[in-house]
Amino acid sequence: MADGSSDAAREPRPAPAPIRRRSSNYRAYATEPHAKKKSKISASRKLQLKTLLLQIAKQELEREAEERRGEKGRALSTRCQPLELAGLGFAELQDLCRQLHARVDKVDEERYDIEAKVTKNITEIADLTQKIFDLRGKFKRPTLRRVRISADAMMQALLGARAKESLDLRAHLKQVKKEDTEKENREVGDWRKNIDALSGMEGRKKKFES
């Protein structure tokens, strides 16, 4: 289907000429307390990442649902064979009904056993949950801090191994950068030490500390 919007509508519009503000406008900025340190990720980028993560999560859920449907279909096709009635008469169909009834009885027995197991497990889970609540009452729960999670960590948690390769590269770059800054700090520290030693400050410092 053709898109209704024209190409002209898609072109970026030229930016309007900057408006000259009065100096009084800027005084407010100077007097206001400084804004908090800006986040590395912009709000739009954060939103974009969140949308992306939700999309991925949705796809994963859909894929899982599809897998479950396929699994169910496969299970049914192995258990429920198609009825092949060509060439079979009343006698065989009677016998087939007996066979199928016997199979239904067997499946019913199995279902009863499974239901009994499930009921038992549910009871056990309920008991254990109660025990957990009882134990919780005896211990003071620590106050939980809100943890900021980086976009990388979020992607890692959601995508698992698939995101690892792309994330590893970034992590490696950060690591190198960090090592460089540490090296710089060490060098600065060493230079100060040398100056102190030369000016006899080291000895005086020790005296003062003692």
């Epitope: 092949e84 060509a86 060439g87 079979l88 008469g89 065989e92």
Partner: antibody
Framework: EVQMVESGGGLLKPGGSLKLSCAAS????????MSWVRQTPEKRLEWVAT????????YYPDSVKGRFTISRDNAKNTLYLQMLSLRSEDTAMYYC??????????????WGQGSSVTVSS | DIQMTQTSSSLSASLGDRVTISCRAS??????LNWYQQKPDGTIKLLIY???RIHSGVSSRFSGSGSGTDYSLTISNLEQEDIATYFC????????TFDTGTKLELK
Amino acid sequence: EVQMVESGGGLLKPGGSLKLSCAASGFTYSNYAMSWVRQTPEKRLEWVATISSGGSYSYYPDSVKGRFTISRDNAKNTLYLQMLSLRSEDTAMYYCARRDNYYGSTFMDYWGQGSSVTVSS
Amino acid sequence: DIQMTQTSSSLSASLGDRVTISCRASQEITNYLNWYQQKPDGTIKLLIYYTSRIHSGVSSRFSGSGSGTDYSLTISNLEQEDIATYFCQQGNTLPLTFDTGTKLELK
């Protein structure tokens, strides 16, 4: 022309095993149920086994249940009868027959020439 | 199991005769009865199915009738090629069962 040709018969000792084959031609094999019928030396006809068109269902009389297995290969248009723990009373001419039905009435409309099986010590 | 019995194991007739072969079931078989012909060379052919329906390629000289437990096969105007053994078979209940057969001979 509808045709069935049996093979694999022979002479063997009690307790032995044998596999009969039946090559079918002249019709769409996978559309029909098939049967094995035997004729004893006293000329009595006995139904031995039936298999559905796709091979999912099989039927046997109590006299052979657990010892005989009917199977089919629709790609090869071939019917089989695997016979285990053979007894002297299994001595017979084994016929392969095509099955059909009419309003629930089931019958063998075309028969092979037969394959002879003799079980003797 | 349903037992199938024929009134006579052999029957003598002359060419051109009208011959009737009877068959009885040990219980009701609701018209699920078939007739087969076995020639002396061992070849077996279906003649009649569902009591009275003639199989394709079979001469109209053959006819079938009956109901409940009693059934019969009739050959009108007997011919040389009809000399064979005739079997009835029930298709009502498994196991499918045949009678011992009636051998038709010339007088």
